[in-house]
Interface confidence: medium
């Protein structure tokens, strides 16, 4: 089965610095997304060999790519505190496959010593299963997708 190897698991960087996230697969992709999952899910980039990459407006001008869609390194520049979060590679194949995630901790320079990554990779439980019913995504992706909130969460 297709897998996505993602590195690093976690990185701590000061405001204004850059970070590299690498997404590697065994090939056979249509393309790859980098997504930020959480309370406000966000597609960061979509990359496909031979196609102009699509970048979220929040990151426009701050993203570089190297490699190919099978072994892609995404560099995010001029990081801001608000960029802190877990970034997950998603390979688009016949079924959608997710990487393990990269936790990016952006810190004020003087406080960098207080916020350190542990050696452990992000736990799968950070990305709970999706809902059941007609909205169920591909079963192969189920363990990697967060729950959509109930309608009662509407403002």
């Amino acid at each position: 089965a297709q897998e996505v190897q993602q590195s690093p698991h976690c990185t701590t960087v000061p405001v204004g610095a850059s970070v590299n996230i690498t997404c590697s697969t065994s090939g056979g992709l249509r393309g790859i997304y980098l997504r930020q999952l959480g309370p406000q899910p966000q597609d960061i980039i979509y990359y496909e060999d031979g196609v102009v990459p699509t970048t979220d407006r929040r990151f426009r001008g701050r993203i570089d790519f190297s490699g190919s869609q099978d072994n892609l390194t995404i560099t995010m520049h001029r990081l801001q505190l608000s960029d802190t979060g877990t970034y997950t590679c998603q390979a688009i194949t016949e079924v959608n496959v997710y990487g393990s995630g990269t936790l990016v901790l952006v810190t004020e320079e003087q406080s960098q010593g207080w916020h350190r990554c542990s050696d452990a990779p992000p736990r799968a439980s950070a990305l709970p299963a999706p809902p059941t019913g007609s909205a169920l995504p591909d079963p192969q992706t189920a363990s990697a997708l967060p729950d959509p909130p109930a309608a009662s969460a509407l403002p």
Epitope: R30, T54, R57, Q90, P130, S134, A135, P148, A150, A151
Partner: nanobody
């Protein structure tokens, strides 16, 4: 009960403009990519545009690029399709669809609206 309701269709002259709305109920729109599709009489349903859950990424069919603009207001649970420089070949029923954490370029659509008719004719 998830529902998507399209509105804003109608009859417009060539070169005119329309703004379609897609209002969602029964889901929190901020977790869903939204797509617009259209189906002309006797033709297959075709892709028009998609927008990411956050609204920061958009994707368009070549046939509408530069004329149509997709946008969203998650606070109002509504997605818009602004259509300018309309042509007779844009005549179709326009549908919106929602997909949980969906992909812009590989959009399937978990939930679909019933459509709104757009007719471009002089």
């Amino acid at each position: 009960q998830v529902q998507l309701q399209e509105s804003g269709g109608g009859l417009v002259q060539p070169g005119g403009s329309l703004r379609l709305s897609c209002t969602a109920s029964g889901l929190t729109l901020g977790y869903y990519a939204i797509g617009w599709f259209r189906q002309a009489p006797g033709k297959e349903r075709e892709f028009v545009s998609t927008i990411s859950a956050s609204g920061g990424m958009t994707y368009y069919a070549d046939s509408v690029k530069g004329r149509f603009t997709i946008s969203r207001d998650n606070a109002k649970n509504t997605v818009y399709l602004e259509m300018n420089s309309l042509k007779p070949e844009d005549t179709a029923v326009y549908y919106c669809a929602a997909e949980y954490l969906g992909n812009l370029r590989h959009f399937r659509g978990d939930h679909w609206g019933k459509g709104t008719q757009v007719t471009v004719s002089s």
